[in-house]
């Protein structure tokens, strides 16, 4: 399977909610003995191999945000955690998955990983992460709205197998 | 090796427009915001504005009608400029790099060029 | 803005003895649990240099000597034992909400 971003680009004002989004593409094992572990973070846009860094969204970790389950099941985070610092993620019966970010600053301007992992039980893991830009405008040059960039082809199904 | 230099007249005349640029290596010009910091002489730091990474520029209310900040990537260049010149602009104009991908803060800053306004 | 004070604004030091700054902030530098407070150290004809960034981190090649603490409004950097090489003007300065702003700056001289 691959993970594709939709949006490369997300570009958004101050005080506005917005949802990155990445895809799961591809043959899924619904096997019983297969669950996916997604999660969302924060990494360095100087990175030679991107999102190799996994740094905090809003002080929560990986672990803080995932969601573990099997299939394309529906899951979300319902902690309180990730609601205190304005955070939800999420993933749909399609093979959508996705973090929504509440009430946007300067601050949350950054890359954004999403990263899935096979687990086969006894087996191997099979690992997969997209990246997309946020950036938070402030000022007369932000716009009212968040306006996103699609991804190229090319970028949209970017896989970085491990 | 990450660098950033300043460049410009030392001497601008009142009401004129001061215009500086700094020339940056090292780095990806879509990775970092580049702000400009001046020194007034005898004087603490005092930041003017920033353009980030995608190209949107923030400013100090006390400068905004009269700065404009931008970029030329094909040149590795952030430009200055202020407008309307007073003998109080005459400072040690700066350029700094900030690390923004998590931890906001200046990490790498140019030499500085002083610039005195002056008839 | 966000106006930041600190105090002493200069002060005279033994080497080998400890010093330490303090900066207040007019309202909090926290964002979801990190501090956007920084320390930079301007030495004479130089510009400044990071020492500190999110309130405790000591940046790389920094000497251990040097440490950051607090959180909120009230912050802290300390010289567990000052040398002559820490003669300079030190400065703090918020990254919490634009414009970011500088303490006014504190003289560290030797005795």
């Known amino acids: 399977f691959k993970v594709a971003t939709p949006y490369s680009l997300y570009v958004c004002p101050e005080g506005q909610n917005v949802t990155l989004t990445c895809r799961l593409l591809g043959p899924v094992d619904k096997g019983h003995d297969v669950t996916f572990y997604k999660t969302w973070y924060r990494s360095s846009r100087g990175e030679v191999q991107t999102c190799s860094e996994r740094r905090p969204i809003r002080n929560l970790t990986f672990q803080d945000l995932h969601l573990h389950h099997g299939g394309h099941q529906a899951a979300n985070t319902s902690h309180d955690l990730a609601q205190r610092h304005g955070l939800e993620s999420a993933s749909d019966h399609h093979g959508n998955f996705s973090i929504t970010m509440r009430n946007l600053t300067l601050l949350d301007s950054g890359l954004y990983c999403c990263l899935v992992v096979e687990i086969r039980h006894h087996h191997s893991e099979h690992r997969v992460h997209g990246a997309m830009e946020l950036q938070v405008q402030t000022g007369k040059d932000a716009p009212s709205n968040c306006v996103v960039y699609p991804s190229s082809s090319q970028d949209s199904e970017n896989i970085t197998a491990a | 090796q990450v660098q950033l230099q300043e460049s410009g007249p030392g001497l601008v005349k009142p009401s004129e427009t001061l215009s500086l640029t700094c020339t940056v290596s090292?780095?990806?010009?879509?990775?970092?915001?580049v702000h400009w910091i001046r020194q007034p002489p005898g004087k603490g730091l005092e930041w003017i504005g920033v353009i980030w990474s995608g190209g949107n520029t923030d400013y100090n209310a006390a400068f905004i009608s009269r700065v404009t900040i931008s970029v030329d990537t094909s040149k590795n260049q952030f430009s200055l400029k202020l407008s309307s010149v007073t003998a109080a602009d005459t400072a040690v104009y700066y350029c700094?790099?900030?690390?923004?991908?998590?931890?906001?803060?200046?990490?790498?800053w140019g030499q500085g060029t002083t610039v005195t306004v002056s008839s | 803005d966000i106006v930041m004070t600190q105090t002493p604004l200069s002060l005279s030091v033994t080497p080998g003895q400890p010093a330490s700054i303090s900066c207040r902030a007019s309202?909090?530098?926290?964002?979801?649990?990190?501090?956007?407070m920084q320390w930079y150290l301007q030495k004479p004809g130089q510009p400044p240099q990071l020492l500190i960034y999110a309130a405790s981190n000591v940046k790389s090649g920094v000497p251990d000597r040097f440490s950051g603490s607090g959180s909120g409004t009230d912050f802290t950097l300390k010289i567990s034992r000052v040398e002559a090489e820490d003669v300079g003007v030190y400065y703090c300065q918020q990254s919490r909400k634009v414009p970011w702003t500088f303490g006014q700056g504190t003289k560290l001289e030797i005795k």
């Open positions: 090292g780095f990806s010009l879509t990775s970092s915001g």
């Open positions: 700094a790099r900030e690390d923004y991908d998590y931890d906001w803060y200046f990490d790498v």
């Open positions: 309202e909090s530098v926290e964002y979801y649990g990190t501090s956007l």
